[in-house]
Interface confidence: medium
């Protein structure tokens, strides 16, 4: 592993619950930089595999709002617009942290919690089970 | 809007800090139940928009190691396994949470941080510009 | 749709403080954050500073910070500004807008500002 | 602090005529750029996000492109209640910047 030198004006350690339980900064820092810039796409319209996005929304949760791809079919689009079932749509996921109020509620209390989310689809030959 | 009333359990807000910095119990709850991520571990190379994938690993952030897409080819692939480059392989973006060490080096401080990740590639029709 | 209604015009004198408040209703009061803009007579749009309403964590322009001071009641789901030391330069339109603060995922965006209040007229008058 | 220029400041148009206005950031912004409509005594609406993006119920004469540092809000065929100012907006960076607004007039 990579060993991290302690800085000595880290805030003091000594709560019974540490290392648990730790102090986070809220005002969030957007490192969105301009080698990555974010490019408003239609791209669940366009692909071979379309999506639609749906609404999740929780208060408990940071952040309360999260938008779930579900794929449209089970195959793909080919180059005459229809579905094509030789292929298939699959959904890409993706493993994300979010914030949740611990105990329900509280303002100034949370837990991290992992939630995976579907985030688009792609298009991928299938996998052919032949039968002996 | 939806009301959310306080918890009398709620811990104390007294900290001339608050409520910039909060407690985050780091326990990580996992909420993929039923799920296996491990199943679309195999899209990237049977995708008709495959992607490598990168590892991104910064020891001052938490999650250290992020997994970045980036498209193997700039069409995709066809029925007959060749690029095919009236279609276009893109990335599909996601935004999601981080924390990061503040001040840096210390183990139980930390600063929410927002990064852009590519999750996989999709293949799209692309957007013909007709010049006049 | 999330519908944004400010308090009523003040009149404050030089020195003064000011607190206008914002009553969200509509939607989830913690998935979004609020923004103020001002506005002087036959001025442009300034943006003075927003919040996350989950956290409370607050963001200022520089210029106002130390005496700006933005808060969110979620159990009434309304969100204040506050601002002190008031001079002849504050007079102007205080609005309140909606920033949608949902995480980038390709379509869906953040940071518009897609909601507005109504507007405050504060005059600032010896 | 990212810079946003508009021009021009002034526009006396005829209606049914096309209007262009441009913004120009400091720094690139990708295409975080966003475009409001104000009326006399009104609150500004909102009427393209993220430089290309139209909200539902915005009218389709209204449209914008650009990316990186210029941008344009192009409004095909105006109408009498289209008069009003025009500001664009940029999230990329804190702090949150508007340019100067462009005010539009009917002739």
């Known amino acids: 592993g990579i060993t991290i030198p302690r800085n000595p004006g880290c805030p003091n350690s000594e709560d019974k619950n540490f290392p648990r339980t730790v102090m986070v900064n809220l005002n969030i820092h957007n490192r969105n930089t301009n080698t990555n810039p974010k490019r408003s796409s239609d791209y669940y319209n366009r692909s071979t595999s379309p999506w639609n996005l749906h609404r999740n929304e929780d208060p408990e949760r940071y952040p309360s709002v999260i938008w779930e791809a579900k794929c449209r079919h089970l195959g793909c689009i080919n180059a005459d617009g229809n579905v094509d079932y030789h292929m298939n749509s699959v959904p890409i996921q993706q493993e994300i942290l979010v914030l949740r109020r611990e105990p329900p509620h509280c303002p100034n209390s949370f837990r991290l919690e992992k939630i995976l989310v579907s985030v688009g689809c792609t298009c991928v030959t299938p996998i052919v089970h032949h039968v002996a | 809007g939806i009301t959310i009333p306080r918890n009398p359990g709620c811990p104390n807000s007294e900290d001339k800090n608050f409520p910039r910095t909060v407690m985050v119990n780091l326990n990580i709850h996992n909420r993929n139940t039923n799920t296996n991520p491990k199943r679309s571990s195999d899209y990237y190379n049977r995708s008709t928009s495959p992607w490598n994938l990168h590892r991104n690993e910064d020891p001052e952030r938490y999650p250290s190691v992020i997994w970045e897409a980036k498209c193997r080819h700039l069409g995709c692939i066809n029925a007959d396994g060749n690029v095919d480059y009236h279609m276009n392989s893109v990335p599909i973006q996601q935004e999601i949470l981080v924390l990061r060490r503040e001040p840096p080096h210390c183990p139980n401080s930390f600063r929410l941080e927002k990064i852009l990740v590519s999750v996989g590639c999709t293949c799209v029709t692309p957007i013909v510009h007709h010049v006049a | 749709e999330v519908q944004l209604v400010q308090s009523g015009a003040e009149v404050k004198k030089p020195g003064e403080s000011l607190k206008i408040s914002c009553k969200a209703s509509g939607g989830s009061f913690s998935s979004y954050g609020i923004v103020w803009v001002r506005q002087a007579p036959g001025q442009g749009l300034e943006w003075m500073g927003g919040?996350?309403?989950?956290?409370?964590?607050?963001d200022y322009a520089q210029k106002f910070q130390g005496r700006v001071t933005i808060t969110a009641d979620e159990s009434t789901t309304t969100a204040y500004m506050e601002l002190s030391g008031l001079t002849s330069d504050d007079t102007a339109v205080y609005y309140c807008?909606?920033?949608?603060?949902?995480?980038?995922?390709?379509?869906?965006?953040?940071?518009?500002?897609?909601?507005w209040g109504q507007g405050t007229t504060v005059t600032v008058s010896s | 602090e990212i810079v946003l220029t508009q021009s021009p400041d002034f526009q006396s148009v005829t209606p049914k005529e096309k209007v262009t206005i441009t913004c120009r950031a400091s720094?690139?912004?990708?295409?975080?750029l966003h475009w409001y409509q104000q009326k006399p005594d009104q609150s500004p609406k909102l009427l393209i996000k993220y430089a290309s993006s139209s909200p539902s119920g915005v009218p389709s004469r209204f449209s914008g492109s650009g990316s990186g540092t210029d941008f344009t809000l192009t409004i095909n065929g105006l109408e009498a209640e289209d008069a009003g100012t025009y500001y664009c907006h940029q999230s990329f960076s804190l702090p949150v910047t508007f340019g100067p607004g462009t005010k539009v007039d009917i002739k």
């Open positions: 807008a909606r920033d949608p603060n949902e995480f980038w995922n390709g379509y869906y965006d953040t940071h518009d500002f897609d909601s």
């Open positions: 720094q690139n912004i990708g295409e975080e």
């Open positions: 919040i996350t309403t989950f956290f409370g964590a607050t």
